[in-house]
């Protein structure tokens, strides 16, 4: 059990007070990270809190401001990147958002040795990308779906490529559905290590069917919205590899790389590119079918200015339990020889663990085994290996850092960060400088976050980073839900959970249960990270017991829990909800009268169809932006669980896992469907369809939808969401207002 | 050794076609860009048309329309099909490696005259 | 499309003595952009000087380059009989590639 730290005592109990949902719109109770900006073995950038840009150095103690506030408002900054030579800066202003990670702004350069920006030869704008070479300051950017490289800032631009089209071919950055489903960058150009290459990435989607939507503004007549969206079973973005020498880029030009020959027979993604030296380069492919993954190296043959990628440097990944990795195909991390490489794959008890591949796949070495699962390789230096995972005390939504000592034999391994503030903080995650001289370590939870200060060597904390003092004041006269992580075991399936209580709770009395959802194939809701949110407002003000499950179809606990949902989405995910529920009211502290469901994305599809279960558990439910059928969806993210839809492939269960389908169903619960109409990802037609199901089937059910958001419900549309879906569920309890 | 060998040239009328043709060894010619650069007589050096080893074809506005690049890397073979012939098209035309600069290896040129 | 401008258009030295001829553009080229060439009578051009300043393969070393922004250089240290021709300095910087319209360097 976790629970909390009380800090309640029956004196002081009148000057405490709930949460409010005030409280939490205003997002009073948000915590903040440290995440160093590392430049060098020992040093790294960190905007102060009066946005100065301050260069520490750990070894000296020192620090000293690089760029001042000044500098940063005379532009409107708010963004910067130093290049790595420490001669300019770039100022990143008028961010304008597009997708989940894209956005495009306008650069200036800044030049550090003269404290003057750097006039002539300005970039234009907006540009969609724009990076520093590793070593040096020649800059590479994306100007209207082509790619430029500048020799030095000051220099003109070269330009790369000059096919670029708007929505037909995206040269070093995604389309749609790379950036959500495979790349998940904005980016989609990689450097050497010394920058004497540039590889990138060409996106051809011209084939590609397009979602159109109208975005409603202010003017007279709506703007229509397009975009290249290749939905389940849909034609493909084609994509093509390009290397180009950016010493000299107008000789022999980019050179295309070639695809290994048993992924390029069918249709096929390119899923990520690592260099590992300045010549030589990794290159990832997968197969539509999504189960075969290919890892090619390939080597500059300098005599023939080629690519080459040997037969020989072929790694093949193949899952026959479900799809290849996990949410995405991991990415090597490469050891100092520069052709052996660590990477996170199932083992053959299904478990997904670290091995060491030196010539083959089949001859890997196995680093980490057990029933738990690694989860990130942060960095790999001569003689440790720092890598993530949920082993410490059976807890999976638990993450601790681990080193392994790779330079002695037999390998040792050490928690680095198991025992450090034990009760607080049981999910890590890690930042290292150059060669691991030092790192940060950024605690999530349970309790107050925290970032600290380590040293690679010795692991020693050498200062704290962030520890949100204010934050642990403010919520000194808060009453806090209670928290506990548990588990149900049920057919030999084990239900993780966590439960939110009240802060009063008592287990004799009868509470309104709401659960919450989002389940979708390799996720994880239960974790052990700290939360001041909604569900935090509504158990602490409202009285509400909440409660997250995560069911098949969920990480980090083996492939059998994984793979289970493989081709049948919509399925195992509901039943273990509703196991769950079942479950929850055994315990005795549950009003049965007054269960809920709420979700949103992949989460409102699973509780639109537990609402539709026929179970007569559930009394309402809220399904934010749902899926409704997996045709809707993208084919990169739909075909990876569920195949095609097609007969002769998994048409069938498309068809049967609806939630149009089901329609019927609702009549005995209380729905509240809601929507983004300009949603980019999941798109307003799929609530437009349950909708219109509920009106065929003369369903009664409550809608909002919100104009001109998408996916995220940002802005003003948050308050109003959570206003609304709070009087809906305060309604459905029948809880005084 | 690297060589580049022209050939196709000759004697047209205005308004017709010829199709150039540069035969290349001693280097991967299917991994290099290549281009067609001209000189009219007793004048400069002009640029006409570079194709990338991938396929991808660039030129120069002066022939935009009216030539087309291309390649048979099996063949190791640069073509250029030049349609529409126009007088200030007579010129030696030279095929070299190399996409936008730094041509390192050079044809030894043939000469095409459009006149009527 | 950039111009270059080359001067002299004429340039009559003698054997031994130093050659300075000057390329001017219309507008910046990077250095990594700049070629020079030479080209003799009835025959194709030969690439001498890449990336403003660094010899190609087999170019001797009383060949040099220099210059940034919109001008640039080509010095021949000591005239050979065999430099006697025509130079063309050309960039790559954006397309279409432009030569310039050549210096010829004669026997005085």
């Known amino acids: 059990i976790v629970l909390r730290p009380s800090r309640v005592h029956n004196s002081e109990e009148n000057t405490m007070r709930a949460l409010t949902l005030k409280d939490i719109l205003n997002g009073t109770f948000s915590y903040k990270t440290f995440f160093p900006n590392w430049i060098s073995g020992q040093e790294y950038l960190h905007q102060s809190a009066d946005n100065n840009i301050v260069l520490y150095n750990i070894e000296t103690g020192q620090s000293y401001t690089i760029l001042s506030n000044r500098t940063m408002k005379s532009v409107n900054a708010s963004n910067y990147g130093l290049s790595p030579d420490r001669q300019f800066v770039y100022l990143e202003s008028d961010y304008s958002k597009l997708w989940r990670y894209s956005y495009t702004a306008t650069y200036y350069i800044y030049d550090l040795s003269n404290g003057e920006f750097v006039r002539g030869n300005e970039l234009p704008r907006p540009i969609q990308y724009l990076c520093w070479s590793p070593v040096g300051s020649k800059l590479a950017y994306v100007y209207q779906n082509n790619i430029y490289l500048k020799q030095r800032p000051g220099d003109p631009p070269f330009q790369i490529t000059f096919n670029g089209r708007e929505n037909k071919i995206f040269n070093g950055i995604p389309d749609w559905v790379y950036e959500e489903e495979m790349l998940a960058t904005k980016y989609a150009l990689w450097w050497s290590p010394n920058g004497k290459f540039l590889a990138y990435a060409e996106f051809n989607d011209t084939d590609i069917p397009v979602i159109a939507y109208s975005y409603y503004g202010d003017e007279q007549y709506p703007r229509t919205i397009n975009i290249p969206y290749p939905k389940a079973g849909a034609k493909n973005p084609v994509v093509r590899i390009f290397i180009i020498d950016t010493t000299y880029p107008a000789y022999v030009g980019p050179q295309e790389v070639p695809v290994p020959a048993m992924i390029a027979s069918s249709d096929y993604y390119f899923s990520w590119l690592t260099w590992v030296t300045d010549e030589r380069v990794c290159l990832q492919w997968l197969k539509r079918v999504q189960n075969v993954s290919v890892l090619s190296i390939c080597d500059f043959r300098e005599d023939w200015q080629t690519w080459d990628c040997p037969k020989t440097q072929e790694h093949i990944e193949e899952s026959r339990t479900g799809w290849a990795g996990g949410f995405f195909v991991s990415t090597p991390v490469f050891s100092y020889d520069a052709i052996s490489y660590y990477k996170i794959f199932s083992d053959k008890d299904g478990y997904k663990h670290i091995h060491y591949i030196k010539d083959t796949v089949e001859n890997a070495i196995q680093i980490t085994s057990g029933k738990w699962e690694a989860i990130n390789i942060f960095r790999v230096t001569q003689d440790s290996l720092f890598y993530s995972s949920n082993e410490f005390e059976e807890y999976p939504g638990r993450r601790n850092i681990y080193r392994i000592s790779i330079g002695s034999y037999p390998p040792s391994k050490k928690c680095v960060t198991c025992h450090l503030r034990k009760e607080r903080c049981q999910y890590y995650t890690a930042s290292f400088s150059d060669y691991a001289k030092y790192y940060a370590l950024v605690c999530y939870g349970p309790g107050i976050p925290i970032s600290t200060l380590h040293d690679g060597r010795t692991d020693q904390e050498i200062k704290i980073l962030e520890e949100n003092k204010e934050l642990e004041n403010a919520l000194k006269n808060i009453q806090l839900p209670k928290e506990e992580i548990k588990k149900l075991e049920v057919d030999e399936i084990t239900l993780w959970y966590k439960m939110i209580l009240p802060p009063q709770f008592d287990r004799s009395k009868k509470y309104p249960l709401l659960i919450q959802v989002y389940g979708g194939p390799c996720s994880q809701s239960v974790r052990s990270v700290f939360a001041v949110n909604w569900i935090s407002y509504l158990a602490s003000k409202e009285g509400m017991v909440i409660a997250l499950v995560d069911g098949r179809g969920t990480a980090f606990q083996g492939d059998k829990l994984l793979y289970a949902v493989y081709r049948k989405l919509g399925v195992y995910e509901v039943e273990d909800q509703i196991t769950a529920v079942r479950k929850f009211i055994e315990m005795g502290f549950i009003d049965e009268k007054r269960i809920a469901i709420w979700g949103w994305s992949y989460g409102g599809y699973v509780s639109s169809l537990a609402l539709a279960s026929g179970t007569g558990l559930f009394k309402c439910g809220i399904a934010v932006a749902p899926v409704s059928s997996w045709e809707y969806y993208a084919s990169v993210y739909t075909e990876r669980f569920m195949g095609l839809p097609t007969k002769d492939d998994n048409l069938e269960h498309y068809k049967n896992s609806t939630v149009m389908a089901r329609a019927e169903y609702f009549r005995n619960v209380d729905y509240l469907l809601i929507h983004g109409t300009a949603d980019d990802n999941v798109h307003f037609q799929n609530s437009a369809q349950i909708a219109k199901a509920l009106v065929n089937a003369q369903v009664d059910f409550q809608a909002m939808w919100y104009s001109d958001q998408n996916h995220g419900l940002s802005g003003l549309s948050t308050n109003h969401l959570y206003t609304h879906m709070t009087h809906f569920l305060k309604q459905c309890f029948s809880l005084s207002d | 050794e690297v060589q580049l060998l022209e050939s196709g040239g000759g004697l047209v009328q205005p308004g017709g076609s010829l199709r150039l043709s540069c035969a290349a060894s001693?280097?991967?010619?299917?991994?290099?860009?290549m281009s067609w650069v001209r000189q009219a007589p007793g004048k400069g050096l002009e640029w006409v048309s570079a194709i990338w080893a991938s396929g991808e074809q660039y030129y120069a506005d002066s022939v935009k329309g009216r030539f087309t690049i291309s390649r048979d890397n099996s063949k190791n073979t640069l073509y250029l099909q030049m349609n529409s012939l126009r007088a200030e098209d007579t010129a030696v035309y030279y095929c070299?490696?190399?996409?936008?600069?730094?041509?390192?290896?050079w044809g030894q040129g043939t000469l095409v005259t459009v006149s009527s | 499309e950039i111009v270059l401008t080359q001067s002299p258009g004429t340039l009559s030295l003698s054997p031994g003595e130093r050659a300075t001829l000057s390329c001017r553009a219309s507008q910046s080229v990077s250095r990594s952009y700049l070629a020079w060439y030479q080209q003799k009578p009835g025959q194709a051009p030969r690439l001498l000087i890449i990336?403003?300043?660094t010899r190609a393969t087999g170019i001797p070393d009383r060949f040099s380059g220099s210059g940034s922004g919109t001008d640039f250089t080509l010095t021949i240290s000591r005239l050979e009989p065999e430099d006697f021709a025509v130079y063309y300095c050309q960039q790559g910087q954006v397309i279409p590639p432009t030569f310039g319209q050549g210096t010829k360097v004669e026997i005085k």
């Open positions: 070299a490696k190399g996409w936008l600069g730094n041509f390192d290896y």
């Open positions: 001693g280097f991967t010619f299917s991994s290099h860009a």
């Open positions: 990336g403003a300043s």
